[in-house]
Interface confidence: low
């Protein structure tokens, strides 16, 4: 079998999720001494960077600017090191948001409830979609789909405290394009002393591991930094 | 080493189409980046165009989309601006810039052509 | 749009002493800003971009700083050829726009 390096991380800075006609960047870990990084979009080569120096940066960003429905889908990178090649990384999906229309995201029985109760969320959007996200900001990764035809419902079942935080919900016109986000909704739940922590209510639903980790390294030392390659030129 | 430089008339009536041509020395327009008008009255600051990229798409300030076209000859390795029906408004260096900078966005421009003054008047 | 507001529009300093430009943006950018400098019947030269990186061959005595809404361009010790007019610029979503300059004089 032919020999390939490991396979390189690759993560969205901030968020996945990009309103339409913003800048997305992509970073691609990968090793030191890499010289080129591919990034690639639903299979085909979409942008190269070569860092500089390459054996003191073991990363690079790829900037994706005027964020639209043509550059949302599945990106992934590679790397080489000399003439020997990475294996891909895995697949890491890109949104654009703010697309079209607003959803109403309502609650019921009602934003304060306590804990035991079964709880539903409706995510309503009377133009054409069929499938409805609702995310908890904080937790982007963890989205909920539901499908209807103007409206979806989401039931939580019996909450507890772990389910207090701000909830938001996207209409999605295909998998990789979706609309504004609704206005926030606040679930409080009441009654349950074990976990009493709030959820993180920064409207861009950032994820702690969705910043770019790149290190450089300076004679003998790492510095973890939020590396931009650039930086060294 | 880029280079860019801009040529078209220095003068052009109102109501008419300004054109100017940016010929790209050093880089093939086709290799990457996007290729970008911007423009500064006398006087005055500076106002981004529009853009052509790499692989021929193109984006447009807002404030002109009505009016402007930009193309590309990639045989000639050269870029192109059409404006329709100027005004004295449109009276103004007209430069031409890489976008797309060691990683950075499109939107940084490090290469640009010295500019060409168009004045609109009858 | 995203609007850009620099301070001051123009300012007089000697040579040697610290200047110090501003740029207030109307919307989070987060660090997609370029400074650029632009003398009399030149085009605009880039300076820093992404906020803090220096372009090449851009002398150490310019540096940028801030993130979000609010950036600053600092000249740490003016020299006679760095008189000349200082642009900022977004480069987050497009349409990118500049701020209106800020002329630098000799004093």
């Known amino acids: 079998p032919k020999q390939t390096l490991p396979k390189p991380i690759i993560r969205a800075e901030s968020t996945y999720m990009v309103p339409k006609e913003k800048q997305a960047t992509l970073c691609c870990q990968g090793s030191y001494g890499a010289v080129e990084y591919q990034l690639h979009f639903e299979g085909s080569l979409f942008a190269v960077e070569r860092p500089k120096p390459p054996e003191r940066i073991n990363g690079v960003k790829f900037h994706i600017p005027d964020m639209n429905s043509r550059k949302a889908g599945r990106y992934s990178c590679i790397y080489r090191v000399g003439e020997l090649w990475s294996e891909r990384s895995d697949l890491l999906d890109l949104v654009v948001t703010e697309m079209y229309d607003t959803p109403t995201l309502s609650v019921h029985p009602g934003p304060e409830v306590t804990s035991g109760e079964k709880v539903t969320f409706y995510c309503r959007l009377d133009t054409a979609t069929s499938m409805f996200l609702l995310l908890k900001e904080g937790r982007s990764r963890d989205v909920q789909r539901s499908y209807g035809k103007v409206q979806a419902e989401f039931p939580m079942g019996p909450v507890t405290t772990a389910h207090r935080g701000s909830y938001r919900c996207f209409g999605s016109y295909n998998n990789y394009a979706w609309s504004f986000p609704s206005e926030p909704v606040k679930l409080l739940v009441t009654g349950d002393i074990e976990n009493t922590s709030l959820a993180p209510t920064d409207p861009t639903f950032p994820d702690s591991w969705d910043t770019c980790l790149l290190t450089r390294e300076t004679g003998l030392q790492k510095d973890l930094a939020l590396w931009d390659h650039t930086a060294q030129n | 080493q880029v280079q860019l430089q801009e040529s078209g008339p220095g003068l052009v009536k109102p109501s008419q189409t300004l054109s100017l041509t940016c010929t790209v020395s050093g880089y093939s327009i086709t290799s990457d980046y996007a290729w970008n008008w911007i423009r500064q009255p006398p006087g005055k600051g500076l106002e981004w165009m529009g853009y052509i990229t790499y692989s021929g798409s193109t984006s447009y300030n807002p404030s002109l989309e009505s009016r402007i076209t930009i193309s590309r000859d990639t045989s000639k390795n050269q870029f192109s601006l059409k404006l329709s029906s100027v005004t004295a408004a449109d009276t103004a260096v007209y430069y031409c810039?890489?976008?797309?900078?060691?990683?950075?966005?499109?939107?940084?421009?490090?290469?640009w052509g010295q500019g060409t003054l168009v004045t609109v008047s009858s | 749009d995203i609007q850009m507001t620099q301070s001051p529009s123009s300012l007089s300093a000697s040579v040697g002493d610290r200047v110090t430009i501003t740029c207030r943006v109307s919307e989070n950018i987060y660090s997609y800003l370029a400074w650029y400098q632009q003398k009399p019947g030149k085009a605009p030269k880039l300076l820093v971009y992404n906020a803090k990186t220096l372009a090449e061959g851009v002398p150490s005595r310019f540096s940028g700083s801030g993130s979000g809404t609010d950036f600053t361009l600092t000249i740490s010790s003016l020299q006679p050829e760095d008189f000349a007019t200082y642009y900022c610029q977004h480069h987050y979503g497009t349409p990118w726009t500049f701020g209106g300059g800020t002329k630098v004089e000799i004093k």
């Open positions: 810039a890489r976008g797309g900078y060691y990683g950075s966005s499109w939107g940084v421009f490090a290469y």
